[in-house]
Interface confidence: low
């Protein structure tokens, strides 16, 4: 039975041109973790393995970095990065789990939700 | 403490294998990756391989596929690194090391194993 | 495979002296490196990861910096344990590489 639970940074925005943290937590069991996914719409962005550590989708490289953790940051947002964002937890022996997180990247100066997630 | 036993020093004919075993305490077994490295002559250091004692997945560096092949035994919380076809190049001291999921650097180390391999 | 990069491959220094080593890396690993310690005909120890956090029970005169492909170690103040051979890492993915080593001399 999958008893676990993930946690996410929920619906989070961020200013053009800057960057966010996309956090995911899977909590509430002990199953073993074997991969990450995180994925934007139908597109891979990024993949951190537990024998093979993290990779990046080519197409990616210059605007996404590994972690914190398994997180993953954004760099240089343009408005066409608003959207969804998934978090896959690939696990044994529960199977998968999946959490979702929307970005809405603003034109704005002020970006009102998801601050704590910021980075300067 | 965590700790990473390995045997004294080998010495083995050319042609022939070696079983180099590395038995871990102090710690859950399947929480941590294995890997193995080879340093050569007090030479910079070459990982082999690692693997995942949880599951048995191993991955190795290209150079030494078909030389290396690493097993684990859950009971004992031993893991192996058998060479085969052993030639004056494989002449070196071998470590096994935990690693850390999801950022394989390397926290403990074994005290190492020198092969010698010679006639 | 990454390649690592480190310089100088050997120095000499006096107790007191600060030192940095450098490592660069052959394409972007982002923060992932790893720093060891390793004396004669001992086991590596593990310094740094993730270039600048410090191992648990690491002396606060270590430190790492660095991001992309270039990294370094400072020593401030070197204390006669700290002579021997230094190795970075990267732990970005497999294969993991180490540089060629620093070996760190006493004056």
């Known amino acids: 039975m999958m008893t676990g639970t993930i946690e996410t940074t929920g619906n989070i925005s961020a200013e053009k041109g800057g960057s966010i943290i996309l956090q995911c937590h899977l909590s509430s069991t002990t199953a073993q973790v074997t991969q990450v996914n995180w994925e934007q719409q139908d597109q891979l962005l990024a993949i951190c393995n537990a024998d093979l550590g993290w990779h990046i989708s080519p197409s990616f490289k210059d605007r996404v970095a590994p972690g914190p953790g398994l997180g993953l940051t954004l760099q240089s947002l343009t408005v066409n990065d608003t959207g969804e964002y998934f978090c896959i937890y690939h696990t044994y022996p529960d199977g998968t789990y999946t959490g979702r997180i929307f970005l809405e990247v603003l034109e704005s100066s002020v970006a009102e939700h998801g601050a704590r997630f910021q980075i300067p | 403490q965590v700790q990473l036993q390995q045997p004294g020093p080998e010495l083995v004919k050319p042609g022939a294998s070696v079983k180099i075993s590395c038995k871990a305490s102090?710690?859950?077994?399947?929480?941590?990756?294995m890997n193995w490295v080879k340093q050569s002559n007090g030479k910079s250091l070459e990982w082999i391989g690692v693997?995942?004692?949880?599951?048995?997945?191993?991955n190795y560096n290209q150079k030494f596929k078909g030389k290396a092949t690493l097993t684990v035994d859950q009971s004992s919380s031993t893991a192996y690194m058998q060479l085969n076809s052993l030639t004056s190049e494989d002449s070196a001291v071998y470590f096994c090391?935990?690693?850390?999921?999801?950022?394989?650097?390397?926290?403990?180390w074994g005290q190492g194993t020198t092969l010698t391999v010679s006639s | 495979d990454i390649v690592m990069t480190q310089s100088p491959a050997s120095l000499s220094a006096s107790v007191g002296e600060t030192v940095t080593i450098t490592c660069r890396a052959s394409?972007?690993?982002?923060?992932?490196l790893a720093w060891y310690q390793q004396k004669q005909g001992k086991s590596p120890q593990l310094l740094v990861f993730?270039?600048?956090t410090l191992t648990e029970g690491v002396p606060s005169r270590f430190s790492g910096s660095g991001s992309g492909t270039q990294f370094s170690l400072k020593i401030n103040s070197l204390q006669p344990e700290d002579f021997g051979s230094y190795y970075c890492?990267?732990?970005?993915?497999?294969?993991?590489?180490f540089g060629g080593g620093t070996k760190l001399e006493i004056k």
């Open positions: 090391a935990r690693g850390v999921y999801f950022g394989n650097y390397f926290d403990s």
């Open positions: 102090g710690y859950s077994f399947t929480d941590y990756n």
């Open positions: 693997i995942n004692p949880n599951s048995g997945t191993d």
């Open positions: 394409e972007n690993i982002y923060s992932s």
């Open positions: 993730n270039a600048k």
């Open positions: 890492q990267h732990h970005y993915g497999a294969p993991w590489t």
